[in-house]
Interface confidence: low
């Protein structure tokens, strides 16, 4: 891999062992200034595998609010607007990083945590495994 | 909102002003032990709005590798396996938090950053604007 020289202006730290503790500035830099947050906001309703969004709140986590998608149907919506159970609505899941207060209730000490969230739903063809 | 009492065992810090700097333990705690990572791994291929996964690598970011979904078609795959352009494949996007090395190339100093990633694709009915 590429070795990037260490910046001499870095804060000093004993960074020899994992698990390691680092300094993180919580002033979020948003790279999405050019994106329209409403751009995909109605996909949940217009999809052939529509979903509802459920609020998941946890004050010990940063961000404290995460929205979870739950597929509305087992099947997918067909051209007639009916649910077709020959197809399946399934959640698209993604692992994301969050910060968990550790020790609990501490305002300035966190551990990185990986959680699985459902972002939306997609319509898939089922696979049948034929057992010999 | 609920006021949670501060844990007296918290590390000491001057936490008066934003932007604030916090301590983060990078030893990731994975909450997904019960999930099967392969469970949704083939949805990208079986979806009626299939997608390809592109590797996005940035050594100045943590995690350094993020996978981006790109929809394969403008339309959706119909029951005959053909692309139906009466429907649209669209990316499902999610804002996620990453850590950006700041100052650059520092191993132990980061700023929280919000980025928009495409997680997968879903098939939607197009909105047709009728011009009077």
């Amino acid at each position: 891999g590429i070795t990037i020289p260490r910046n001499p202006g870095c804060p000093n730290s004993e960074d020899k062992n994992f698990p390691r503790t680092v300094m993180v500035n919580l002033n979020i830099h948003n790279r999405n200034t050019n994106t329209n947050p409403k751009r995909s906001s109605d996909y949940y309703n217009r999809s052939t595998s529509p979903w509802n969004l459920h609020r998941n709140e946890d004050p010990e986590r940063y961000p404290s609010v995460i929205w979870e998608a739950k597929c509305r149907h087992l099947g997918c919506i067909n051209a007639d607007g009916n649910v077709d159970y020959h197809m399946n609505s399934v959640p698209i899941q993604q692992e994301i990083l969050v910060l968990r207060r550790e020790p609990p209730h501490c305002p300035n000490s966190f551990r990185l945590e990986k959680i699985l969230v459902s972002v939306g739903c997609t319509c898939v063809t089922p696979i049948v495994h034929h057992v010999a | 909102g609920i006021t949670i009492p501060r844990n007296p065992g918290c590390p000491n810090s001057e936490d008066k002003n934003f932007p604030r700097t916090v301590m983060v333990n990078l030893n990731i705690h994975n909450r997904n032990t019960n999930t099967n990572p392969k469970r949704s791994s083939d949805y990208y291929n079986r979806s009626t709005s299939p997608w390809n996964l592109h590797r996005n690598e940035d050594p100045e970011r943590y995690p350094s590798v993020i996978w981006e979904a790109k929809c394969r078609h403008l339309g959706c795959i119909n029951a005959d396996g053909n692309v139906d352009y009466h429907m649209n494949s669209v990316p499902i996007q999610q804002e996620i938090l990453v850590l950006r090395r700041e100052p650059p190339h520092c191993p132990n100093s980061f700023r929280l950053e919000k980025i928009l990633v495409s997680v997968g694709c879903t098939c939607v009915t197009p909105i047709v604007h009728h011009v009077a």
Partner: antibody, heavy 125, light 107 residues
Framework: EVQLVESGGGLVQPGGSLRLSCAAS????????MAWVRQAPGKGLEWVAT????????YYRDSVKGRFTISRDNAKNSLYLQMNSLRAEDTAVYYC??????????????????WGQGTLVTVSS | AIQLTQSPSSLSASVGDRVTITCRAD??????MHWYQQKPGKAPKLLIY???NSEIGVPDRFSGSGSGTDFRLTISSLQPEDFATYYC?????????FGQGTKVEIK
């Protein structure tokens, strides 16, 4: 080996309530959609309700909508059917049913490969 | 609701006979048709799933065929243990529906 054991059946008066339970073992319960199917004495099979693995989606036959509630406790590997405002026509053997394990279409497999022994619900005054 | 009509409602046959039971749906159920066997006082047993796939452990004298709206369960050579009631089930559309049953009796 998949095992489904129903309990909670019995005699109840019209308008009364009953809660059926189904204890499941031998498969990853939380991954699978589950169902209740009933059979009135001397009659055919009748699907009653289905619940998705996560519990987020439930489906009912019209005649029980608003009266019956299907639910699950994935931590306890248990399926439930809360039956309220019971009627004489609800008299039946109630079976808990689970899908096959070899079908990997999605999180949901929708036909019934495994059945419990059934529990009899009698609604009579 | 999709209605399934089985025929015949009952039949008498001898050991060794070839028996065919039909199930007709009043609209297409694609390939989401399944067949069950039930004996008195027992839970139903899955025989055939998705039109023509035999469940594990089911003797190969049982076979399924059909598509769309018309489906058949065939027992190529009836055995003493096959005397039972047979049901078709569609899981294409909620509410899921069963046929009214076909009782196979000894002649």
């Amino acid at each position: 080996e998949v095992q489904l054991v129903e309990s909670g059946g019995g005699l109840v008066q019209p308008g009364g309530s009953l809660r059926l339970s189904c204890a499941a073992s031998g498969f990853p319960f939380s991954t699978y959609a589950m169902a209740w199917v009933r059979q009135a004495p001397g009659k055919g099979l009748e699907w009653v309700a289905t619940i998705r693995g996560s519990g987020e989606s439930t489906y009912y036959r019209d005649s029980v909508k608003g009266r019956f509630t299907i639910s699950r406790d994935n931590a306890k590997n248990s399926l439930y059917l809360q039956m309220n405002s019971l009627r004489a026509e609800d008299t039946a053997v109630y079976y808990c049913a689970s899908p096959p394990q070899y079908y990997e279409g999605s999180i949901d497999r929708l036909w019934f490969a495994h059945w419990g022994q059934g529990t009899l619900v009698t609604v009579s005054s | 609701a999709i209605q399934l009509t089985q025929s015949p409602s009952s039949l008498s046959a001898s050991v060794g006979d070839r028996v065919t039971i039909t199930c007709r749906a009043d609209e297409s159920v694609r390939t989401l048709m399944h067949w069950y066997q039930q004996k008195p006082g027992k839970a139903p047993k899955l025989l055939i799933y998705l039109v023509s796939n035999s469940e594990i452990g089911v003797p190969d004298r049982f076979s399924g065929s059909g598509s769309g709206t018309d489906f058949r369960l065939t027992i190529s050579s009836l055995q003493p243990e096959d005397f039972a009631t047979y049901y078709c089930l569609q899981t294409y559309s909620y509410p899921f529906t069963f046929g009214q049953g076909t009782k196979v009796e000894i002649k």
